[in-house]
Interface confidence: low
Amino acid sequence: ATIKLHDQSIGTQQWEHSPLGELCPPGSHRSEHPGACNRCTEGVGYTNASNNLFACLPCTACKSDEEERSPCTTTRNTACQCKPGTFRNDNSAEMCRKCSRGCPRGMVKVKDCTPWSDIECVHKESGNGHNI
């Protein structure tokens, strides 16, 4: 297999000559060999931009209350999300919280719980939304 970088096919040997001079392409890091780059190991490390790093960034392991949304590739870190039945508000650093079991009396559920938001309820009469 080959990867295409800047219209230049580059093989998957241990190191590759960087097409950007001193910078190595995403998915690799600077080698001890001048002008060469080492590829990151799939599932172990990644770099998501052209770089001058001497090592790939380590892949993140999902926390115990999370599951993997997409695996770590050589160019992208692991993406984690809350396990089914739990949620964490967007861009929040808090732990995953259990989804609400139902809506308060007089309200009806209009949106299921997702890994990013709790269920959403609206008043039966007014239709005004309310996040639990």
């Epitope: 599951e67 993997e68 949304r69 997409s70 695996p71 590739t73 993406a79």
Partner: antibody, heavy 116, light 109 residues
């Protein structure tokens, strides 16, 4: 609720190109991997390939030379093309969303028959 | 098929049945296993993920386990609506892709 819908011609002639499209609704096409899986009549499931939102592909080695997958984020679609089809490509074709290494949502499938 | 499943299994209502899935170090040995249920003339449905986790809505009669390079699906309190084809699936590192078992047709007698 995420829904996936396969569409495309149900009949393809031998040696021609099979073209299918999967349309995603009720959810984002970004941040996920998307797969195609097929099932020949009376047989088991066979993974065809996967694509991520950035267009990075990963194909079944046995089909790699004939398969092309792309993604259109604006239309929320990911098409599949298989070149030089034969009767062996007759199957039910499913598209699915990959949550990490789990296919959690599947389309209902579309049957493609290869015949002259 | 890369993963080996028995082609058929059967049981009477209320019984417990187990379906096996045998692989190798490059697939089941180093990756998590998912199980899919395919009812007649329908698309596969995720039944068990990450070896032993049930998606919401799947009864706790269904359970999964993994040991070494093999996995198994157990169904207790068998019901007539469990009659379906069951497939195991996992990632295969050497092939760089998804692999499935050949499927097991479960008959409720």
């Amino acid at each position: 609720q995420v829904q996936l819908q396969e569409s495309g011609p149900g009949l393809v002639k031998p040696s021609e190109t099979l073209s299918l499209t999967c349309t995603v609704s009720g959810g984002s096409i970004s941040d996920y991997y998307w797969s195609w899986v097929r099932q020949s009549p009376g047989k088991g499931l066979e993974w065809i390939g996967s694509i991520d939102y950035a267009g990075s592909t990963n194909y079944n080695p046995s089909l790699k030379s004939r398969v092309t997958m792309t993604i259109d984020k604006s239309k929320k679609q990911f098409p599949l093309k298989i070149d030089s089809v034969t009767a062996a490509d007759t199957a039910m074709y499913y598209c699915a969303r990959q949550l990490g290494r789990i296919s959690d949502y599947w389309g209902q499938g579309t049957l493609v028959t290869v015949s002259s | 098929y890369v993963l080996t499943q028995p082609p058929s299994a059967s049981g009477t209502p209320g019984q417990r049945v187990t379906i096996s899935c045998a692989g190798s170090s490059s697939n089941i040995g180093g990756n998590t296993v998912n199980w899919y249920q395919q009812l007649p003339a329908t698309a596969p449905k995720l039944l068990i993920y990450s070896n032993n986790q049930r998606p919401s809505g799947v009864p706790d009669r269904f359970s999964g386990s993994k040991s070494g390079t093999s996995a198994s699906l157990a169904i207790s309190g068998l019901q007539s609506e469990d009659e379906a084809d069951y497939y195991c699936a996992t990632w295969d590192d050497s092939r760089g892709g998804w692999v499935f078992g050949g499927g097991t047709k479960l008959t409720v007698l």
